[in-house]
């Protein structure tokens, strides 16, 4: 009996430019003889419904149709037919199929590969054209993929134990697509510093599929009109 097992859940998520290993494990009732077996990896893009051969291994012959694609012969001996793709790109997302032949048996498995890019975030203070005691803080998130992103603003006053989400005076612009396929977006917070308590911490919170925990950039309102510093951008609430 010949069986192939892919990533549990049927989906693998990998960061852009990463050296990704797409898992494929072979289960066979006898020890594997790699000289008399074949492995073929196929890829089907998200945009075209056409399957393309990525890598092929047959006995003493192996060929990478995608530059750098490799299946380790040493790992194959122990049933690991995982495909390694260096420097994965956004357009390489899609369905990958691992086909194993141990004559006369054949088994296959598929997995969806999602390529994500994590946003970089920075805070900017824009005082151009603003009234007295009025500041506009801009939170720029750039280089992320996929397009779906959630940007919120929070404040934490001195007195209360938890942060408060700010919904008023927040404008988040449209996402802009970059040449490399990633996206940028800017969210703005308008603050009247004269109405806020000194010591209040404000932060821009970015949530995205590529992030395990939200990305935060913050600043503390001082008695004087505020200017951002690098330390404040990375400081915790503490």
């Amino acid at each position: 009996d010949l069986k192939v097992e892919m990533m549990a859940g049927g989906t693998q998520i990998t960061p852009l430019n990463d050296n990704v290993t797409i898992f494929c494990n072979i289960f066979y009732s006898q020890p594997l003889n790699i000289t008399s077996m074949g492995i073929t990896w196929f890829w089907k893009s998200l945009t075209f419904d056409k399957e393309v051969k990525v890598f092929e291994f047959f006995g003493d012959h192996q060929e990478a149709f995608r530059p750098g694609a490799i299946v380790s012969p040493w790992r194959l001996k122990s049933g690991d037919a995982s495909l390694r793709l260096p420097g994965i790109q956004l357009e390489e997302a899609g369905e990958y199929r691992c086909e194993v032949v141990v004559t006369p048996l054949k088994a296959q498995g598929t997995v969806q590969l999602e390529v994500v890019a994590s946003p970089a975030s920075r805070l900017l203070l824009d005082q151009v054209g603003m009234k007295e005691n009025e500041d506009k803080y801009m939170c720029e998130s750039s280089g992320f993929y996929p397009e779906a992103i959630n940007i919120t603003w929070e404040k934490q006053t001195q007195k209360f134990p938890h942060p408060i989400e700010i919904s008023e005076d927040v404008i988040t612009g449209p996402t802009i697509k970059n040449m490399d396929g990633t996206f940028n977006v800017t969210s703005c917070l308008k603050l009247n510093s004269s109405q806020e308590d000194p010591g209040t911490v404000y932060q821009c919170v970015v949530r995205h599929a590529s992030l395990h925990t939200p990305l935060r950039s913050n600043f503390t309102l001082t008695a004087a009109r505020h200017s951002l510093s690098e330390t404040e951008k990375t400081d915790n609430f503490s």
Epitope: T157, Q158, K159, P161, H162, E165, R216, S238
Partner: antibody, heavy 117, light 107 residues
């Protein structure tokens, strides 16, 4: 990292007073507001009051006004909560707490105060 | 003072179950609600703030929802370490007030 270390357990007689301390470390002490909570055995949580650590502002729960006093010693980064005219229903674990960071608010380990004749 | 009415006061469930705890505020508190977990003999640990935002490090099986007066804490798939007591708290105004707690027990 932020740490709030409270004084040890106390046993008091009804009518007496108790003073619980909370020593803070790991952050700029005076920039914060410290709350005090209590929890009677097997019961819920109750806010008693708070103090701004620069020492210029307090806010007490009406229920405890006249019996509770919160003070600060900035030289030792310590906050004190004194409760007077103790009665048996004041038997509880007393906690100092401070506003948090991304992982939540900070709490001391708690101080058990037992009021018994 | 704002009253926070939490229900149920106790709840029996099994590992893997989905459970929901509710909290009702006596007046509109917006989204200014936090949820705590407290293990015996320990200080409470905050899980959720602003009604639905998880603190970093809190497992994704914990989620909060609601605004105004009605709030819920949901644990999507109970783990052995989740069987303990949970409290809601309003922080829109002083005095800060808590729900009476929900004790989650193994069935």
């Amino acid at each position: 990292q932020v740490q709030l270390v409270q004084s040890g357990a106390e046993v008091k007689k009804p009518g007496a007073s108790v003073k619980v301390s909370c020593k803070a470390s790991g952050y700029t002490f005076t920039n914060y507001w410290m709350n005090w909570m209590r929890q009677a055995p097997g019961q819920g949580l109750e806010w008693m009051g708070g103090i701004y650590l620069s020492g210029d502002s307090t806010d007490y729960n009406e229920k405890f006004k006249g019996r509770v006093t919160m003070t600060v010693d900035t030289s030792t980064s310590t906050v004190y909560m004194e409760l007077s005219s103790l009665r048996s229903e004041d038997t509880a674990v007393y906690y100092c707490t401070r506003r948090g960071d991304y992982f939540g608010d900070f709490w001391g380990q708690g101080t058990l105060v037992t009021v018994s004749s | 003072d704002i009253q926070m009415t939490q229900s149920p006061s106790s709840l029996s469930a099994s590992v893997g179950d989905r459970v929901t705890i509710t909290c009702k505020a006596s007046q509109n508190v917006g989204k200014y609600v936090a949820w705590y977990q407290q293990k015996p003999g320990k200080a409470p640990k905050s899980l959720i703030y602003s009604a639905s935002n998880r603190y970093d490090g809190v497992p994704s099986r914990f989620s909060g929802s609601g605004s105004g007066t009605d709030f819920t804490l949901t644990i999507s798939s109970l783990q052995p370490e989740d069987f303990t007591t949970y409290y809601c708290q309003q922080y829109i105004s002083y005095p800060l007030t808590f729900g009476a707690g929900t004790k989650l027990e193994i069935k």
